[in-house]
């Protein structure tokens, strides 16, 4: 798998988008996980519904949000109140049994709000070490969402 | 109505090399996985590996990886499963096995099943 | 990999009887488990999926529990098409693993 970066601005909301073969996946809990180290295991975040069918529910761990579009094929997680500690290596998954397939590699990259004149020295960014051949990246810089806002995916 | 027909019985020596196949209908070939099963005479099931004809992806046992090759061709909803040099122990009944996901816990179990395929390999 | 067992390998049992089999495996599979049957020179058929749900066309008389390690088929009353070979299946993991078979004979 190619490892796609997605990058958003601190203090936001960044949305990751996961696309699948919706037939493929047919009947598949989906998850979001966070790589430890490039070779280390992928610890889950959040996943999506219990209930399959009830997939397109939104479901929160903390700050990260998931749902899953199991018609169109597309699984969204939204990032909100992005920090310089989220940015990393990511998987979005499709679960089977205890099983788990990799349905995109997902490099978070947390831009310095340029609105806020702090020390941007914690920043992350992959240094030459953790270089990502072939990455394509999807530049994803979204406003803070509005008190009480639902962030729906864009309908795009 | 679902059917996975295969093809007929096999009579081959040691060395020689085969192809048997898994013909589906009744629902959409590509939309689901196949499995190939391995019954050696007497004995229980063994999982030999999976296909997604969609993609052709494939996974294997890897008490099979290397020893068989498992294809698909979507265009005429047939599975396979080749050798390409056959051994005495591959004597056995080979099932294909459509699997489909139940929502209710998001894992995978066999609902149909091919007649089988007799393969004997002996000098 | 999984390891699967059943028990007891074969049972000698009439019409009309009830009939438990077990099936237990080497490690936690959830509730990820399947019971298939298989008549002599027949391919196996999908008796109960996901532990405890039963397979469209399956008779009421089949019924399966557990969950974690231990598992149980049950038939509730004997019926003459029934005596035939039945094997758990485990669908938690690669590779997905059979138990040996227990065959059910007529007594």
């Known amino acids: 798998h190619n490892t796609t970066v997605f990058q958003g601005v601190a203090g936001q909301s960044l949305q990751v988008s996961c696309p699948y073969d919706s037939m493929k996946h047919w009947g598949r809990r989906k998850a979001w996980c966070r790589q430890l180290g490039e070779k280390g295991p992928c610890q889950r975040v959040v996943s999506t519904h219990n209930l399959w069918l009830l997939s397109f529910l939104r479901r929160w761990n903390g700050s990260t949000a998931i749902t899953d579009d199991t018609l169109g094929g597309t699984l969204t997680i939204t990032l909100r109140n992005l920090q310089p500690h989220d940015a990393g290596l990511y998987q979005c998954q499709s679960l089977h049994g205890s099983e788990a397939d990799t349905l995109r590699k997902v490099l978070v990259e947390v831009l310095a709000d340029p609105l806020d004149h702090r020390d941007a020295g914690d920043l992350w960014f992959p240094g030459e070490s953790e270089s990502f051949e072939d990455a394509h990246v999807e530049h994803s810089i979204s406003r803070s969402l509005l008190e009480g806002e639902i962030p729906f995916p864009p309908t795009s | 109505e679902v059917q996975l027909v295969q093809s007929g019985a096999e009579v081959k020596k040691p060395g020689e090399s085969l192809k048997i196949s898994c013909k589906g209908s009744g629902y959409s070939f590509t939309s689901y996985w196949i499995a190939w099963v391995r019954q050696m005479p007497g004995k229980g099931l063994e999982w030999m590996g999976i296909?997604?004809?969609?993609?052709?992806?494939?996974r294997y046992s890897n008490s099979f990886q290397g020893q068989v090759t498992i294809s698909a061709d979507k265009s005429i909803s047939t599975a396979y499963l080749q050798w390409s040099s056959l051994k005495a122990s591959d004597t056995a009944m080979y099932f294909c096995?459509?699997?489909?996901?139940?929502?209710?816990?998001?894992?995978?179990?066999?609902?149909?099943w091919g007649q089988g395929t007799l393969v004997t390999v002996s000098s | 990999d999984i390891q699967m067992t059943q028990s007891p390998s074969s049972v000698s049992a009439s019409v009309g009887d009830r009939v438990t089999i077990t099936c237990r495996a080497s490690?936690?599979?959830?509730?990820?488990l399947a019971w298939y049957q298989q008549k002599p020179g027949k391919a196996p058929k999908l008796l109960i999926y996901a532990a405890s749900s039963l397979q469209n066309g399956v008779p009421s008389r089949f019924s399966g529990s557990g969950s974690g390690t231990d598992f149980t088929l049950t038939i509730s009353s004997l019926q003459p098409e029934d005596f035939a070979t039945y094997f758990c299946?485990?669908?938690?993991?690669?590779?997905?693993?059979f138990g040996q078979g227990t065959k059910l004979e007529i007594k």
């Open positions: 096995a459509r699997q489909r996901t139940f929502y209710y816990d998001s894992s995978d179990y066999f609902d149909y």
């Open positions: 299946q485990q669908a938690d993991s690669f590779p997905r693993t």
């Open positions: 296909i997604y004809p969609g993609d052709s992806d494939t």
């Open positions: 490690q936690g599979i959830s509730s990820w």
